[in-house]
Interface confidence: low
């Protein structure tokens, strides 16, 4: 059967928490098994023996978006015996040949999903955007937790605006769902939101929304 | 209040076995990502890691190190041992205790100084 | 493993800030740490998960690509010591060689 081959280019694919590892190359004559590191340090095994190139891990990173988790991917040949005791994964007395992961902080690597600015609600010469406060798939106590429930006051929109007729444009940062401008009437004003984790140096921010112009939004309203 | 102290004896002949003893209060081996790990520097030179353990008994040895060295806890006596087998000259060094929480260091002890000579 | 590279003296005139590297591959994609450590006593931590302070404001952390610094703003005489960087790779801690900071 042949020794089977390490994987390569290990790669962790992550929006909102929503969280696969991926990796190469598909196997010949042997299967994969991705074993991450729990909370207390130990090895789980998931995907076991997967002809996959990728593991979707969401269940184990969500339970701690703090933690540093560690993974890695075991090469197992596939004709041979193989017992696994829930953190170890042993070929005749020999541990398979692997290659480890980045380490993966949930809290710092997940990448930030698109923004959907929700409404605008006008009150006279004041224009108010809400941004949707997406769901994560973090629980707690059986619930989905949204975006601002985990991140808190480290999560910030930078929103820039600008007059349908200009090309000029504005840019504020908020850190609440919420944003108000002062507006002249019968203007329309054009948005485009992105999010921002404020604590972290690197993947600090989303893609943007699409952009959303208040005379749009009249139309959807039937107005 | 956060304390770790490190015993052992203070001279060891060559080709012996090393055991130092780490005893520690205000902190629980017990917690997640909770860990102790020991520490070298040898006189006027560099701090060098050893080798760690954590709540879980998950156990870990510096690459160089590994096939000389055992570390073990015993949470009812709030210790932590390490054993160092074949001592040598080169490992005369002040030997360290510490807590880790995840990869910080955020506690020492004050360190104990082991010399290796016949 | 990952190898970690300090100058091994930096001097500073008081009052001064003082700069002191740690470089290793790929370092800004984990995190760094300091310590501080003065002749006779362990080490203590001055900066955690690239730029938190463990001990007073004039200490500051960065780390990006393969280069974590330490900044001292407004060097004092008690700051002079060796500092040593610190990171991980996958399952051990890796020390730097430690910088001699002399305060002039």
């Known amino acids: 059967a042949g020794i089977p081959e390490k994987a390569f280019n290990l790669t962790w694919i992550s929006t909102d928490f929503k969280t696969i590892l991926e990796w190469q190359p598909k196997p010949t004559n042997y299967t994969y098994t991705v074993q991450i590191s729990d909370r207390s340090r130990n090895w789980k095994n998931k995907c076991f023996s997967t002809t996959d190139t990728e593991c979707d891990l969401t269940d184990e990173i969500v339970k701690d978006v703090t933690w540093a988790y560690e993974a890695k991917v075991l090469s197992v040949p596939r004709r041979n015996s193989v017992h696994g005791d829930g953190d170890q994964l042993v070929i005749h007395g020999e541990e398979p040949p692997f290659t480890n992961a980045p380490k993966f902080l949930p809290y710092r690597d997940t990448n930030l999903g698109q923004p959907v600015i929700q409404q605008f609600e006008q009150d006279g010469r004041k224009l108010n955007v809400v941004v949707k406060d997406s769901l994560t798939l973090v629980r707690k106590n059986g619930t989905f937790l949204t975006l601002r429930q985990v991140f808190g006051k480290d999560l910030g929109y930078i929103i820039t605006y600008r007059k349908g007729s200009s090309t000029g444009k504005k840019t504020n940062i908020t850190n609440t769902n919420e944003f108000s401008i002062d507006v002249e009437e019968g203007v329309s004003y054009c948005f485009f939101v992105q999010a921002m984790i404020f604590s972290r140096k690197t993947n600090q921010n989303s893609p943007g929304s699409s952009t959303v112009c208040t005379e749009q939004w009249k139309s959807f309203l039937g107005e | 209040q956060v304390q770790l102290k490190e015993s052992g004896p203070a001279l060891v002949k060559p080709t012996q076995t090393l055991t130092l003893t780490c005893t520690f209060s205000?902190?629980?081996?017990?917690?997640?990502?909770?860990?102790v790990g020991w520490i070298r520097q040898p006189p006027g030179k560099a701090l060098e890691w050893l080798a760690l353990?954590?709540?879980?008994?998950?156990?870990r040895y510096s690459t160089s190190l590994k096939t000389r060295l055992t570390i073990s806890k015993d949470t009812s006596k709030n210790q932590v041992v390490l054993t160092m087998t074949n001592m040598d000259p080169v490992d005369t060094a002040t030997y360290y205790c510490?807590?880790?929480?995840?990869?910080?260091?955020?506690?020492w002890g004050q360190g104990t100084l082991v010399t290796v000579s016949s | 493993d990952i190898e970690l590279t300090q100058p091994p003296s930096v001097s500073v005139a008081p009052g001064q800030t003082a700069r002191i590297s740690c470089s290793g591959d790929?370092?800004?994609?984990?995190?760094a740490y300091w310590y501080q450590q003065k002749p006779g006593q362990a080490p203590v931590l001055v900066i955690y998960d690239d730029n938190n302070r463990g001990i007073p404001e004039r200490f500051s952390g960065s780390n990006s690509g393969n280069t974590a610094t330490l900044t001292i703003s407004g060097t004092q005489a008690e700051d002079e010591a060796d500092y040593y960087c610190?990171?991980?790779?996958?399952?051990?801690?890796?020390f730097g060689g430690g910088t001699k900071l002399t305060v002039l």
């Open positions: 610190q990171s991980y790779d996958i399952e051990i801690t890796v």
């Open positions: 510490a807590r880790y929480k995840q990869e910080t260091i955020d506690y």
């Open positions: 353990i954590y709540s879980n008994d998950d156990k």
């Open positions: 205000g902190l629980s081996l017990s917690t997640s990502g909770v860990g």
């Open positions: 790929n370092l800004g994609e984990k995190y």
